[in-house]
């Protein structure tokens, strides 16, 4: 990842958007922005629940942990955190619940040590594909990000820009292959109906993936094969009906994986037989004894682990001539 000692000279050819921030007088070492609380000893700045409409320009250079939660930022422009000298130590940035609806390309540029970013609970109607990569090059400089928290960033239905929300988020995750070093990705509570098939293959360093509380119906086209280091996969509270053989085999092949599958509407018919057999043998699934059938009605609340092949039947499809209206 980027060196945490970028020199100010790297700003000399910056785009115009940097002008105001970069030309500002550098803050005094002990200066704390208005409406914020600062601790130099803890290297922490908290600007919390202050209805700020923009990122303070006079952040102290020592800041390592920056909390900008509960504000009214609306838009994060390019270079929102670019300063001279740069915020070279900033490692953790929390922007959750700050009414952000737009994050522009290059919003997090010039933060060479940024390891953890939390944008949760913002209605992100417009997340630039280059929000995290900073450039539109096919291969960008690697982002230093290791943890990216994007829980509940789905905007209200009427604010979505007539495009796939899943596609918009994934485009930002994959742009320029900048996030190859990402190890924790949280995408819970985003109404995802599907997971684009190429997203996981391009995040090979993932250790923790949280997709809980979405609306995922199937993982048929999702490949986990490359995720050698994946340790936790949270799929609780989705709309999964069954996991098929290919998915089961891939999960079983991951040496350290723990999968969480609670509260999905499992359909216990003949298509469930392979999954039930696998569940009985695997140590991969946490709390597997809690998984129960939701459909068909006659199977509701039956424990998957207690089913046998005789329980898992599919109603025969009647030929058209025998169907009643």
């Amino acid at each position: 990842s980027s060196s945490p000692t970028s020199s100010a000279s790297s700003f000399s050819s910056s785009a115009p958007f940097l002008a105001s921030a970069v030309s500002a007088q550098p803050p005094l070492p002990d200066q704390c922005p208005a409406l914020c609380e600062c601790s130099e000893a803890a290297r922490t700045v908290k600007c919390v629940n202050r209805n700020l409409t923009e990122v303070p320009t006079d952040l102290p250079a020592y800041v390592r942990n920056l909390f900008l939660t509960g504000n009214q930022l609306a838009v994060l422009p390019a270079g929102a955190f670019a300063r001279r000298p740069p915020l070279a130590e900033l490692a953790a940035l929390n922007l959750s619940g700050s009414r952000l609806d737009e994050v522009r390309a290059g919003a997090f540029e010039h933060l060479p040590s940024l390891r953890q970013l939390d944008l949760s609970h913002n209605p992100l109607a417009d997340l630039s594909p280059f929000a995290f990569s900073g450039s539109n090059a096919s291969v960008s400089a690697p982002s230093p990000l290791v943890e990216l928290i994007l829980n509940h960033i789905v905007p209200p239905e009427d604010e979505r820009q007539n495009r796939s929300f899943e596609g918009m988020v994934v485009a930002a995750l994959l742009a320029g292959r900048a996030l190859q070093g990402l190890r924790r990705l949280e995408l819970a509570s985003n109404h995802f109906l599907y997971l684009p098939r190429d997203v996981l293959a391009q995040l090979p360093s993932l250790r923790h993936l949280d997709l809980s509380n979405n609306s995922l119906v199937s993982l048929t086209y999702v490949s986990f094969r490359n995720l050698t280091h994946l340790e936790s996969l949270h799929l609780e509270d989705n709309a999964l009906k069954v996991l098929h053989n290919g998915t089961l085999a891939e999960l079983q092949g991951l040496p350290h994986i723990r999968v969480f599958l609670d509260n999905n509407p499992w359909v216990c018919d003949c298509h469930m037989a392979d999954m039930v057999t696998w569940l009985k043998e695997t140590e991969v699934v946490q709390g597997k004894d809690r998984l129960t059938c939701a459909y068909p009605e006659k199977m509701r609340n039956r424990v998957l682990l207690e089913l046998n092949s005789a329980d898992l039947d599919c109603d025969p499809i009647l030929p058209p001539s025998l169907q009643t209206s």
């Epitope: 945490p4 290791v146 190890r183 250790r207 340790e231 936790s232 040496p255 140590e283």
Partner: antibody, heavy 114, light 113 residues
Framework: SVEESGGRLVTPGTPLTLTCTAS????????MSWVRQAPGKGLEWIGI?????STYYASWAKGRCTISKTSTTVDLKITSPTTEDTAAYFC????????????WGQGTLVTVSS | AQVLTQTPSSVSAAVGGTVTINCQSS????????LSWYQQKPGQPPKLLIY???TLASGVPSRFKGSGSGTQFTLTISGVQSDDAATYYC?????????????FGGGTEVVVK
């Protein structure tokens, strides 16, 4: 926190099991490692056990040491100790994101002598 | 097996001075930056100072700085204080198809005059 126990004086060849007890976190969510330090010497990595139980060992420790776990403890078994195994043995938790030892026990002393 | 070579093995510094400790790995650490630094005082377990090559652990003073990537890493202590007298170890993490491997450097004793 983590706390090691089981260190004592043993004669060469007598199997010895050290135990690391974890409190305040779940061992199923963390990797745990054993590290040793001979008197007046540096740190030496022994091996590691993953959240789900996979184990990896230093080349010198394969066949000489075995790491296992329960829901609350991680054990290190030294199958046939020699005098060269005299050391303080530390148990350490591995960060859930980074591959670094971010929580250490105080260590337990093993002395192998005839 | 991977080897971490730490230099020097011992260094002396005056209060307020600067100490530089080098750590060279026989092969690249995982993701080029899985290198940690620890401080150990007599009779105590090691204490994590820096992880991910350059990230300061919680509560560690900013006079400690880690840098480097791949196979070459450095720990710098600026404005050395008497409390910094200790032995410092680097630790690398490695991954291959056969699994994980960790290694420690031989240690550097820092004496504060």
């Amino acid at each position: 926190s983590v706390e090691e126990s089981g260190g004592r004086l043993v004669t060469p060849g007598t199997p010895l099991t050290l135990t690391c007890t974890a409190s305040g976190f779940s061992l199923s969510s963390y990797w745990m490692s054993w590290v040793r330090q001979a008197p007046g010497k540096g740190l030496e990595w022994i091996g590691i056990i993953a959240g789900r139980g996979s184990t990896y060992y230093a080349s010198w420790a394969k066949g000489r040491c075995t790491i296992s776990k329960t829901s609350t403890t991680v054990d290190l078994k030294i199958t046939s100790p020699t005098t060269e195994d005299t050391a303080a043995y530390f148990c350490a938790r591995v960060s859930s994101i980074y591959y670094t030892f971010n929580l250490w026990g105080q260590g337990t002393l093993v002395t192998v002598s005839s | 097996a991977q080897v971490l070579t730490q230099t020097p093995s011992s260094v002396s510094a005056a209060v307020g001075g600067t100490v530089t400790i080098n750590c060279q790995s026989s092969q690249s650490v995982y993701s080029n930056n899985e290198l940690s630094w620890y401080q150990q005082k007599p009779g105590q377990p090691p204490k994590l100072l820096i992880y991910y090559a350059s990230t300061l652990a919680s509560g560690v003073p900013s006079r400690f700085k880690g840098s480097g990537s791949g196979t070459q890493f450095t720990l710098t202590i600026s404005g050395v204080q008497s409390d910094d007298a200790a032995t410092y170890y680097c630790q690398g993490s490695y991954y291959s198809g056969s699994g994980w491997y960790y290694a420690f450097g031989g240690g550097t004793e820092v004496v504060v005059k």
